[in-house]
Structures are given as structure tokens and as C-alpha cells.
Interface confidence: low
């Protein structure tokens, strides 16, 4: 049996994957434990096995079809259990009545690239990954910069109230080597959170000419 | 066989409130959702609300305010209360089943039952 | 709210005629529905998702569509199929029918 206080935390890709993270105070000895995902409306079921993250905490990914399959849309309901073995039978630990698109984390946005780099500036483009088509263009983002020195908590967040896929970073010190990540998040969804952050991409500014600042 | 019995209409005074029940048999209310939808005389159908298998809510904001869905799971009935009634609310009331495919629709319906708002 | 807009509200034909309904949607709809309704009886559902025929309808029944704008066809008229035809929209809440067809036998 299992005691202590219970938190069970799911978001959606927005196309085929549930991530869900389950918290118990309680210790869980050798107990094995799943979240079993059960549409109002589709034929499909899905369970994945719960591994642990932490002492007290455990994780597990949804996977409901190809990546770019849209698995869901704005009208389902996904009731999400977690459940726990004890002896020859299953417990409920956690239920939820899963709303999909209030529940919103994107996958990080992937291949960064430098477009065009000058000694003061540099542009950058990237894409997102396994995003809804229904989306359309209600999308926002978030960059970061780490400049030498410096850690990434002491990054000044910039924001793009649109979606748009590209930065033009100025103010830039020539010669010197940066990173730069980029998160997205969409506008709807009551407990939509930003996506984790990109993989940084490294840079370095062009030296600047001899004599003259370009 | 999926199977849904809607009772309780009958004659409500304005201002006054109604409990309607659907008792599902052939499936469980814990395992789908059970929709509302009301018709007026002579009138369009009109959704009311949802309460999904779960035990969660969704409701037609036009009557958020004045309506509850509600259910047993022991009983495997589900609720329907609407309060501060008015004569605009006389109606055929309906409580529906989704099928089980891939947005199947309102597959499974209840006869209706007849709620009559009138002094 | 999105408003399904049906056309004609009522039509009279003859049995054996082909009979065409659209459902206009102000806003564009993934999934759509068409239902039947006789008098004094519950709706019954004819066409899941823009054309999937539900379980024990005739293939007389079809429907088409995308976006804003669907059709629901009858190729061939019987006498039971006088009733009111409904579309219905299940891409955002709230669920939301149109006004209804009636369709009478000449």
C-alpha cells in the first residue's frame, strides 16, 4: 500500500506523445506502475511503464503513433490513470480527466543554424518539431543568449509574440564566442507550459576589420 | 446493447429547477461520456453539456451558469440539474452516447423526455 | 460559437429523385455529422466524420466536404426517409447543430 500525497502531471506534444510525471511522498517498493491512457472517443488505448526520475518521483512517454500523426484534437478528452501492481492485481493511484490541448508542451525546436554572421550581429534560424497544424500561426517563442562570463539563468529572455522562425541578435561583441537557445510555446491551453529549451548552438562573431568597426 | 433511459421531465414552474436522470445499461459511465442535448418545440437541437467518463465537465456556456451534470457510478446513471427555469426552457430533453470509433457522432440516443416550464 | 447555416430549411420530392443538403459552417470544422429525424423520435445518426456511414444506414445516404462547407446526398428518395436532417459540428465547444431540413415526398 502506498501512503502520502500524490501529484500526476501530463502534457501533450500537440501530435502523438503524453510525457507524464508521477510524484508520491510514500515509498513504492519494488512496485511496478504504469499510466494507462484511455480516449473518450477513439478505438486506441495506450500504457507506458513508469520509471523513476527521482526518489520520488517517475516518468513515462505516451507514445499514440507516428511522431507527426495528429493523434488528438481540441474536443478530446483522454482519461489518464496511473496504476500501481499490488500482488496479482492493479491499483489506481491517480485519475485524470486529461484535456489535450489545455495541457500543452512542444517538443524543443531543432535544427538551429547560423544564417548570416558580422562581426556585431548574427541571424539565426531554427525549426519546431512535431507541431499541430492547427496551430496555425498562434505560436510564440522565447531565445536566449549566453555571452562569455556568463550563465544561462543570467540570460536576458527574448521574446517573439509571433510566429516566427528566425532572430536577428545585435549588439554583439566581435570575435567572441556565444550559444544561443530558443523555446516555443503555443497561445492556447489553460496549462500550457514552454517547451523545454533547444540544444544550444554555438557561434562566434566576426572579428572586426583593422582600424575600422563594421 | 447500448441502451440510455431518460426520466423526470414533466411540468416545472418558472423560476423552478429540474432534476433529470439517464440510466445507461450496455456500457459503463465510468468508460464513456454522457452528452445532454435538448429540443424545443418545433425547434433545432441544442447541446447542454458533457460530463466525461472520468467524472469532469464541460458545459454550453450559454447555461454554465444554471447547470450542473452530475453522476453515480454504482448506479451508472448520470444527472441533469438545470435551475431558474423559464418558458424558453420547455423542451425535449435527450441524453446521448458517442460511439466508440473515431469520432462516431452521437450514436446512441435516449427516447427523451418531455420537461414543460409553465405557471 | 460556431454557426452551421443548412440549405433549403424545407424541400419536397419525389421518390426515386436525388436530394442534395449543404451545411455551411462560419468557422472551418474538422469533423462533421448528419443525423435523421422522424417525428415524435430521437435523432439517429447517419454519417460520421464528413462521410463515414454509420453502423445499418443505407448506402443511399453519403456525405462530402471540407473546411465550411459539406453536402449530405440521399441518391434515391424512399417514402421513410421524410424527416428533418441535421448536421452537427464536434471540432469546438460548444457542440453546435444546424437549423434542420425537412424533407417532404411530393
Known amino acids: 500500500a502506498v501512503n502520502g500525497t500524490s501529484q500526476f502531471t501530463c502534457f501533450y506534444n500537440s501530435r502523438a506523445n503524453i510525457s507524464c510525471v508521477w510524484s508520491q511522498d510514500g515509498a513504492l517498493q519494488d512496485t511496478s506502475c504504469q499510466v494507462h491512457a484511455w480516449p473518450d472517443r477513439r478505438r486506441w488505448n495506450q500504457t507506458c511503464e513508469l520509471l523513476p526520475v527521482s526518489q520520488a518521483s517517475w516518468a513515462c512517454n505516451l507514445i499514440l503513433g507516428a511522431p507527426d500523426s495528429q493523434k488528438l484534437t481540441t474536443v478530446d478528452i483522454v482519461t489518464l490513470r496511473v496504476l500501481c501492481r499490488e500482488g496479482v492485481r492493479w491499483r489506481v493511484m491517480a485519475i485524470q480527466d486529461f484535456k489535450p490541448f489545455e495541457n500543452l508542451r512542444l517538443m524543443a525546436p531543432i535544427s538551429l543554424q547560423v544564417v548570416h554572421v558580422e562581426t556585431h550581429r548574427c541571424n539565426i534560424s531554427w525549426e519546431i518539431s512535431q507541431a499541430s497544424h492547427y496551430f496555425e500561426r498562434h505560436l510564440e517563442f522565447e531565445a536566449r543568449t549566453l555571452s562569455p562570463g556568463h550563465t544561462w539563468e543570467e540570460a536576458p529572455l527574448l521574446t517573439l509574440k509571433q510566429k516566427q522562425e528566425w532572430i536577428c541578435l545585435e549588439t554583439l561583441t566581435p570575435d567572441t564566442q556565444y550559444e544561443f537557445q530558443v523555446r516555443v510555446k503555443p497561445l492556447q491551453g489553460e496549462f500550457t507550459t514552454w517547451s523545454p529549451w533547444s540544444q544550444p548552438l554555438a557561434f562566434r562573431t566576426k572579428p572586426a576589420a583593422l582600424g575600422k568597426d563594421t | 446493447e447500448v441502451q440510455l433511459l431518460e426520466s423526470g421531465g414533466g411540468l416545472v414552474q418558472p423560476g423552478g429547477s429540474l432534476r433529470l436522470s439517464c440510466a445507461a445499461s450496455g456500457f459503463t459511465v465510468t468508460s464513456y461520456a454522457v452528452h445532454w442535448v435538448r429540443q424545443a418545440p418545433g425547434k433545432g437541437l441544442e447541446w447542454l453539456g458533457v460530463?466525461?467518463?472520468?467524472?469532469?465537465?464541460d458545459y454550453n456556456a450559454a447555461f454554465i451558469s444554471r447547470l450542473t451534470i452530475s453522476k453515480d457510478n454504482s448506479k451508472n446513471t448520470v444527472y441533469f440539474q438545470m435551475n431558474s427555469l423559464r418558458a424558453e426552457d420547455t423542451a425535449v430533453y435527450y441524453c446521448?452516447?458517442?460511439?466508440?470509433?473515431?469520432?462516431?457522432?452521437?450514436?446512441?440516443w435516449g427516447q427523451g423526455t418531455l420537461v414543460t416550464v409553465s405557471s | 460559437d460556431i454557426q452551421m447555416t443548412q440549405s433549403p430549411s424545407s424541400l419536397s420530392a419525389s421518390v426515386g429523385d436525388r436530394v442534395t443538403i449543404t451545411c455551411q459552417a462560419s468557422?472551418?470544422?474538422?469533423?462533421l455529422y448528419w443525423y435523421q429525424q422522424r417525428p415524435g423520435k430521437a435523432p439517429r445518426l447517419l454519417i460520421y466524420?464528413?462521410?463515414n456511414l454509420a453502423s445499418g444506414v443505407p448506402s443511399r445516404f453519403s456525405g462530402s466536404g471540407s473546411g465550411t462547407s459539406y453536402t449530405f446526398t440521399i441518391s434515391s428518395l424512399q417514402p421513410e426517409d421524410i424527416a428533418t436532417y441535421y448536421c452537427q459540428q464536434w471540432s469546438t465547444y460548444p457542440l453546435t447543430f444546424g437549423q434542420g431540413t425537412k424533407v417532404e415526398i411530393k
Open positions: 460530463i466525461w467518463s472520468g467524472g469532469s465537465t
Open positions: 468557422q472551418s470544422v474538422s469533423f
Open positions: 446521448a452516447r458517442a460511439g466508440d470509433a473515431n469520432y462516431d457522432g452521437f450514436a446512441y
Open positions: 466524420d464528413t462521410s
